[in-house]
């Protein structure tokens, strides 16, 4: 909407608002050690941080949600930080016949916004 | 992923988990009274509720996020309830020449999931 403007500067201080962060995880963490061969250690980007009023609003719905959360905080939740896009990654799988490569399009976040 | 299964039954009790809810709002609430016409309150559907482990997971990323949140709750946030789809709605706008209709594709949520 032309009448509510999302903003990109974080009013809470550096690193506090919704952003992409790299998290290390092992195959054991994910419960994947029996069916994924590699990589043994995964670098996963995830969306973390808060979504203060109008920060990185995903769309009109998120702008409205932010506004109504300010008015009815018990009824309407604040927008939250979720992936806006993903980057494809390849995992090496064990299969009955040996090993295969499989691409996952929705495993690692590439960008974040407040929805 | 075939190895983490999203689930659809809420372990927290009825109405507690991520779902669609109708919220009433006035034009004044939204700051729209100068440019939108409406004889009555607006009805908006929004996604509210919690996202317990594997509930309505949006995709592989959300399944992983849920798992890592269990292991590193301070580092990785739990998935949160956001729109999975939107329903197009029409707003009546005031214009210099009178009134016109405009369709918004991203204003009202139609379905919800945990991302």
């Amino acid at each position: 909407s032309a009448h509510l403007h999302p903003r990109d500067s974080c009013p809470l201080g550096p690193g506090r608002c919704c952003h992409l962060e790299t998290v290390q995880a092992t195959l054991e963490d994910l419960g994947w050690s029996d069916w994924v061969l590699s990589p043994r250690q995964l670098q996963l980007s995830m969306c973390v941080g808060e979504c203060p009023h109008l920060y990185r609003s995903a769309n009109t719905h998120a702008l409205i949600k932010a506004r109504l959360h300010g008015l009815q905080p018990d009824r309407v939740p604040a927008p939250c930080c979720v992936p806006s896009s993903y980057t494809p990654v390849v995992l090496m799988h064990r299969t009955d016949s040996g090993v295969s490569l499989q691409t996952y399009d929705d495993l690692v976040a590439q960008g974040c916004h407040c929805a | 992923s075939a190895h983490l299964h999203p689930r659809d039954s809420c372990p927290l009790g009825p109405g507690r988990c991520c779902h669609l809810e109708t919220v009433q709002a006035t034009l004044e609430d939204l700051g729209w009274s100068d440019w939108v016409l409406s004889p009555r309150q607006l009805q908006l559907s929004m996604c509210v509720g919690e996202c317990p482990h594997l509930y309505r997971s949006a995709n592989t990323h959300a399944l992983i996020k849920a798992r890592l949140h269990g292991l590193q709750p301070d580092r990785v946030p739990a998935p949160c309830c956001v729109p999975s789809s939107y329903t197009p709605v029409v707003l009546m706008h005031r214009t210099d020449s009178g009134v016109s209709l405009q369709t918004y594709d991203d204003l009202v949520a139609q379905g919800c999931h945990c991302a």
Epitope: - | L20, T22, L27, V36, L37, S38, P39, R40, Q41, L42, Q43, S45, T87, P88, V89, V90, L91, M92, G98, V99, S100, L101, T103, L107, V108, Q110
Partner: antibody, heavy 123, light 108 residues
Framework: QVQLVQSGAEVKKPGSSVKVSCKAS????????VSWVRQAPGQGLEWMGG????????NYAQKFQGRVTITADESTSTAYMELSSLRSEDTAVYYC????????????????WGQGTLVTVSS | SYELTQPPSVSVSPGQTASITCSGD??????VSWYQQKPGQSPVLVIY???NRPSGIPERFSGSNSGNTATLTISGTQAMDEADYYC??????????FGGGTKLTVLG
């Protein structure tokens, strides 16, 4: 493409009720507003009320308030209109009509119509 | 309640322009839609929001709206345009209101 298929013609006694159904196919049922519009023989169109499945709320024209009930069953993509305390003046063709959700107005811009259901009220 | 007034009938020769009016208090500040209904058939939306046509509606249908009158114009009227036409808007509480309808007769 979108189709609205209504239930068949009805003959009713004065004082009784009638329930007409409208089954939608094509498009997302919950994402639209469904209205009921009637047309007495040789007369014009008259809006009775409507429902928006996603909000679960119905609105009625003042004239029919208290006598008409409009409901929707999302699982079958079907809308219903029940009119009670029927009188001879209720003899008409009843149409269901679908349109976009118009925020604050809810109904109008009827871009798809059912084939109509003739309800005859006679003793 | 808000009232829309239409002439009961309008006649036009084939190929000529037909104008069907819809009068209402300050209707120029309302959104108006027009529906066509042929005998024994369901209505069809032909014009909405001043002069927008749904897909499949010929370009010869257009609309205008100012002051107290909205007008549906059919240029180069054809025999197939013979039908009843209804205007529609909303009252002050947001209820749908239809005009009484106009029967368009294409002469000849």
């Amino acid at each position: 493409q979108v189709q609205l298929v209504q239930s068949g013609a009805e003959v009713k006694k004065p004082g009784s009720s009638v329930k007409v159904s409208c089954k939608a196919s094509g498009g997302t049922f919950r994402s639209y507003a469904v209205s009921w519009v009637r047309q007495a023989p040789g007369q014009g169109l008259e809006w009775m009320g409507g429902i928006i499945p996603i909000f679960g709320t119905a609105n009625y024209a003042q004239k029919f308030q208290g006598r008409v009930t409009i409901t929707a069953d999302e699982s079958t993509s079907t809308a219903y209109m029940e009119l009670s305390s029927l009188r001879s003046e209720d003899t008409a063709v009843y149409y269901c009509a679908r349109g976009p959700i118009i925020m604050g107005y809810q109904f109008g811009l009827f871009d798809h119509w059912g084939q109509g259901t003739l309800v005859t009220v006679s003793s | 309640s808000y009232e829309l007034t239409q002439p009961p009938s309008v006649s036009v020769s084939p190929g000529q322009t037909a104008s069907i009016t819809c009068s209402g208090d300050n209707i120029g500040s309302h959104i108006v839609s027009w529906y066509q209904q042929k005998p024994g058939q369901s209505p069809v939306l032909v014009i909405y929001d001043k002069s927008n046509r749904p897909s499949g509606i010929p370009e010869r249908f257009s609309g205008s709206n100012s002051g107290n009158t909205a007008t549906l114009t059919i240029s180069g009227t054809q025999a197939m345009d013979e039908a009843d036409y209804y205007c529609q808007t909303w009252d002050s509480i947001g209820s749908v209101v239809f005009g009484g309808g106009t029967k368009l007769t294409v002469l000849g």
